[in-house]
């Protein structure tokens, strides 16, 4: 497994998909740390397999962004601020 230190903190970085020389597009990228806390009693009662510790993951997403038109004539998001927020997991 990669070392946690290998993953930079959640911050604005150049978006390699849409940036042009002299015209960078920024994207929120990096790692957010998960929070662990004792599972509340009322939550425990609803669990099929009870867990004493609950971990809460967050993901690096845009807190704010502008929509800009880039070369190729399409709109992209140019992120202006980042934060660690609820992860939305992809369901197949």
């Amino acid at each position: 497994a990669p070392d946690v230190q290998d993953c930079p903190e959640c911050t604005l970085q150049e978006n390699p998909f849409f940036s042009q020389p002299g015209a960078p597009i920024l994207q929120c990228m990096g790692c957010c740390f998960s929070r662990a806390y004792p599972t509340p009693l009322r939550s425990k009662k609803t669990m099929l397999v009870q867990k004493n510790v609950t971990s809460e993951s967050t993901c690096c997403v845009a807190k704010s962004y502008n929509r800009v038109t880039v070369m190729g004539g399409f709109k992209v998001e140019n992120h202006t601020a980042c934060h660690c927020s609820t992860c939305y997991y992809h369901k197949s």
Epitope: P16, F17, F18, S19, Q20, I25, M71, G72, F74
Partner: nanobody, 117 residues
Framework: QVQLQESGGGLVQAGGSLRLSCAAS????????MGWFRQAPGKERESVAA????????YYASSVRGRFTISRDNAKKTVYLQMNSLKPEDTAVYTC??????????WGQGTQVTVSS
């Protein structure tokens, strides 16, 4: 340039799923970034999702994050867009694109996705 052909569009009810495919042919260097774009009637084309050559890096528009998943199979020269929890506002013509270094110079013809409420 790369030739791109999309498939998988159609009519689906809100909350449903579709999987779009984009097959590449021609000068298909594996270093190409691939992406999905969409254009709704009366609106500008917008980026939806993009993926780099080795699938190590992806991009999603905020409006589709957590609902759409982009993936690629370099052996099949195909990129996919799995679209779940579709909403009426996802209705658009979805076009596949290929590019390098921030320049998107190859486009498919597009496939219509209609989400009814």
């Amino acid at each position: 340039q790369v030739q791109l052909q999309e498939s998988g569009g159609g009519l689906v009810q809100a909350g449903g799923s579709l999987r779009l495919s984009c097959a590449a042919s021609g000068r298909t260097g594996s270093t190409y970034d691939m992406g999905w774009f969409r254009q709704a009637p009366g609106k500008e084309r917008e980026s939806v999702a993009a993926i780099n050559w080795d699938s190590a890096r992806t991009y999603y528009a905020s409006s589709v994050r957590g609902r759409f998943t982009i993936s690629r199979d370099n052996a099949k020269k195909t990129v996919y867009l799995q679209m779940n929890s579709l909403k009426p506002e996802d209705t658009a013509v979805y076009t596949c694109g290929a590019g390098e270094g921030g320049t998107w110079d190859s486009w498919g013809q597009g496939t219509q996705v209609t989400v009814s409420s």
